[in-house]
Amino acid sequence: QPDAINAPVTCCYNFTNRKISVQRLASYRRITSSKCPKEAVIFKTIVAKEICADPKQKWVQDSMDHLDKQTQTPKT
């Protein structure tokens, strides 16, 4: 789980070991702050759970791509 020591900086110290079904993912945000020990992605699930994941893993990249496509609006 993400850990906010000094708000507003949230850091991840451990990553989930399992793939999470993309059907259960609602959104994500990237953690790139130099105040954090590692870069991370925090997924928010449909039941509002937040999960730290490793941005180097393919399933994490696929999930972000999937969520990006879902939120894209048609260009006018």
């Epitope: 070991n17 399992r18 793939k19 079904s21 993309v22 259960r24 609602a26 399933w59 696929d62």
Partner: antibody
Framework: QVQLVQSGAEVKKPGASVKVSCKVS????????MHWVRQAPGKGLEWMGG????????IYAQKFQGRVTMTEDTSTDTAFMELSSLRSEDTAVYYC????????????WGQGTLVTVSS | DIVMTQSPDSLAVSLGERATINCKSS????????????LVWYQQKPGQPPKVLIY???IRESGVPDRFSGSGSGTDFTLTISSLQAEDVAVYYC?????????FGQGTKVEIK
Amino acid sequence: QVQLVQSGAEVKKPGASVKVSCKVSGYTLSELSMHWVRQAPGKGLEWMGGFDPEDDETIYAQKFQGRVTMTEDTSTDTAFMELSSLRSEDTAVYYCATHDFWSGYFHYWGQGTLVTVSS
Amino acid sequence: DIVMTQSPDSLAVSLGERATINCKSSQSVLYSSDNKSYLVWYQQKPGQPPKVLIYWASIRESGVPDRFSGSGSGTDFTLTISSLQAEDVAVYYCQQYYTSPWTFGQGTKVEIK
């Protein structure tokens, strides 16, 4: 494509324990979240528990808490479900079930293992 | 826990006629941000494991005949077989996969009249 192959039928005496296995192929077990569902003769489907990646832990249905243990051997891609203190009402077909990365429901099922509890 | 209740427990329908099964959840299984209900319908034939027919309440699984359709949102759902075939004789279950513990309806047995 995920394939799940379960161990064979078992006959147990009341009070004993049973351990059912579920071998995964097509994926590695560590990529999946394995669950167990049982079905008593002529009855409906009953979720017993499984791995919840959102909490990063195995969760159990309240009914089976303290009596069931679900484990994994990732070196052989095999999941196990052990049920202790068996009683006649535990006579059922036990299924392992999982989903792939793209689905959140139980897309893949083992063939089922019949456990008969009888004195 | 979310309780799933199906009705009827069984129904007998003539070949070629419509079969309708209802499923009600005790809490909403709708994720409002994307308007998707996390409900799946399974078909189970004797001696076989369940097979997915419909997910997200209304999306037909690949390879499932189009006589099967799902509808509903939130707490009330319906599985419809538009023209019953002999091979559709089975027990049908709804299940919510919105939140753990995952819960099933008690099942509806469909037979030929």
